[in-house]
Interface confidence: medium
């Protein structure tokens, strides 16, 4: 969590002299309670906006907006504390609007906004606006909170932000996976424009289960410049395990901007559909046989399987 690196942070508006300050998230009014405190914010809205840094980078930011209630407590409103909590890390960042003049009623409702908290793709935040001074221990709360979920890098508008591009969001491998036979899987994908290696992670599952029955990792060396944006194809050898027929292929790039933490792309090939009323075959066997006391899969030749081609 951080604040956007440029622009003097402004909260002044006609009729109000105001300054934005860094905050420890522990306002003085917690320690020294006041007798008279303002009411809570009204209509807190959080939206995703995008902002450029001075360096030209584009970042997603939380746009926080709220209004004041139309009561006399605005006469005791000295400012506001804006707090953003990242839920998966418990990291918190606060800023304080400090009013340098007293608010007066006017015909239009007072409205405030702040768009300088940089947020991360796919992360969830709790945004809180506290009016200051904060209430006495038994007083009515004068804050409002909302949770805010930032779209991940799959979202078209997020893809072009600097943090997403740094993790490889612009690379579209357009993976196709094809079962050649019961023991071979062909994977095709488009290489990116960087001399970096890739890893293909194959995980196979039984038809209706989520416990893997086969795993394999395949290393693809860094392409030469003339191979950038070209299709690469790899044939993977499967273990011919009875019923181990649903394959998930994941491609992990190792781009210089994200190293081991680049966005991965995956494709899945389903088990071949069994006919509703299969014709009897002398040595016909079910796709997989549950056996008491054992969870391994029979390593026989799959005489009953047909070749299905699946494109993703």
């Amino acid at each position: 969590l951080r604040l956007l690196d440029h622009r003097a942070l402004v909260c002044s508006q006609p009729g109000l002299n105001c300054t934005v300050k860094n905050s420890t998230c522990l306002d003085d009014s917690w320690i020294h309670p006041r007798n008279l405190t303002p009411s809570s914010p009204k209509d807190l809205q959080i939206q995703l906006h995008f902002a450029h840094t001075q360096q030209g980078d584009l970042f997603p930011v939380a746009h926080i907006e709220w209004t004041l209630q139309t009561d006399a407590s605005i006469l005791y409103l000295e400012g506001a504390e804006l707090s953003v909590l990242q839920l998966n890390t418990n990291e918190r960042l606060c800023v304080k609007f400090q009013f340098l003049s007293m608010l007066q009623h006017h015909r239009k409702r007072w409205r405030f906004s702040f768009s300088h908290f940089v947020v991360d793709p796919g992360q969830e935040y709790e945004v809180t606006v506290h009016h200051l001074p904060k209430p006495i221990p038994d007083g009515d709360p004068n804050h409002q909170s909302k949770n805010f979920l930032v779209p991940d890098c799959e979202h078209a508008r997020m893809k072009v932000t600097t943090p997403c591009m740094s993790s490889g969001s612009l690379w579209d491998p357009n993976i196709t996976v094809e079962t050649l036979d019961t023991q071979h899987l062909r994977v095709d994908f488009t290489l990116w424009n960087e001399s970096t290696h890739y890893q293909i992670l194959l995980t196979s599952f039984p038809h209706m289960e989520n416990h893997s029955c086969f795993e394999h990792m395949h290393h693809i060396p860094a392409p030469r410049p003339e191979e950038f944006h070209q299709r690469s194809n790899v044939t993977l050898t499967l273990r011919n395990l009875k019923g181990c027929c649903r394959h998930q292929v994941q491609i992990q790039p190792f781009f210089s901007s994200c190293l081991n933490d680049c966005l991965r792309h995956s494709a899945t090939v389903s088990c071949p559909e069994m006919p509703d009323t299969p014709e009897p075959i002398p040595d016909y066997m079910p796709l997989w046989e549950p056996r008491s006391g054992s969870s391994d899969y029979k390593d026989d030749d799959d005489k009953g399987s047909s070749h299905h081609h699946h494109h993703h």
């Epitope: 450029h52 909302k146 949770n147 799959e154 893809k159």
Partner: antibody, heavy 131, light 107 residues
Framework: QVQLQESGPGLVKPSETLSLTCTVS????????WNWIRQSPGKGLEWIGD???????NYNPSLKSRVTISVDTSKNQFSLKLSSVTTADTAVYYC?????????????????????????WGQGTTVTVSS | DILMTQSPSSLSASVGDRVTITCRAS??????LGWYQQKPGKAPKRLIY???SLQSGVPSRFSGSGSGTEFTLTISSLQPEDFATYYC?????????FGPGTKVDIK
């Protein structure tokens, strides 16, 4: 109620540059993406590109080498320039706003879904490329 | 690019008919899809956003469904003003792409 109005010459000569402006009225250009789309006679719709109010652009790769989209927030306008035009660029050109990045509320105060998509369109302007 | 296909390309129907139009994406687009109606000489008008949400002011006879690669627009009871061309639009990834359109005319 936000309204969009395209303007620009209706006739452009081959090899010249097509220039169109879209004026936004009834609302601010800030905090939205703004798109250009075209529709050739009797054909479907083709997205040309878009611009965020801050100036960040995205272009259709098929037109990228010829397209420039710019924005003037002070005039509440954004513009399209398409260079080296041919008769294939004859079309109705539309400007459109990408819908607000909406926050849909689930239970309590949880904001959980984001949606963009072109919700407000101009009425379109016909551009003919001919000598 | 994500290729959007629509079926049928045209259909003839009568007032009161139930009409279904299908849009398929060449790869998964979650629910990042809108449905648009266009009448001759007019700009497209959005009917459905997020694959299934009804645009404000659009009659409830229009509905959308689907996710991933297959999407459907349904008009539960066709009205005279519904004769038009319908397009789907994916905005999951750049370039955004439209379907080729489905023309609905009077039987």
């Amino acid at each position: 109620q936000v309204q969009l109005q395209e303007s620009g010459p209706g006739l452009v000569k081959p090899s010249e540059t097509l220039s169109l402006t879209c004026t936004v009225s009834g609302g601010s250009i800030s905090n939205y993406y703004w798109n250009w789309i075209r529709q050739s006679p009797g054909k479907g719709l083709e997205w040309i590109g878009d611009i965020y109010y801050s100036g960040s652009t995205n272009y259709n790769p098929s037109l990228k080498s010829r397209v420039t989209i710019s924005v003037d927030t002070s005039k509440n306008q954004f513009s399209l320039k398409l260079s080296s035009v041919t008769t294939a660029d004859t079309a109705v050109y539309y400007c459109a706003r990408d819908g607000e990045l909406a926050n849909y509320y689930g239970s309590g105060s949880y904001q959980f879904y984001y949606y963009y998509g072109m919700d407000v369109w101009g009425q379109g302007t016909t551009v003919t490329v001919s000598s | 690019d994500i290729l959007m296909t629509q079926s049928p390309s045209s259909l003839s129907a009568s007032v009161g008919d139930r009409v279904t139009i299908t849009c398929r994406a060449s790869q998964g687009i979650r629910n990042d899809l809108g449905w648009y109606q266009q009448k001759p000489g007019k700009a497209p008008k959005r009917l459905i956003y997020a694959a299934s949400s009804l645009q404000s002011g659009v009659p409830s006879r229009f509905s959308g469904s689907g996710s991933g690669t297959e999407f459907t627009l349904t008009i539960s009871s066709l009205q005279p003003e519904d004769f038009a061309t319908y397009y789907c639009l994916q905005h999951n990834s750049n370039p955004f792409t439209f379907g080729p359109g489905t023309k609905v005319d009077i039987k």
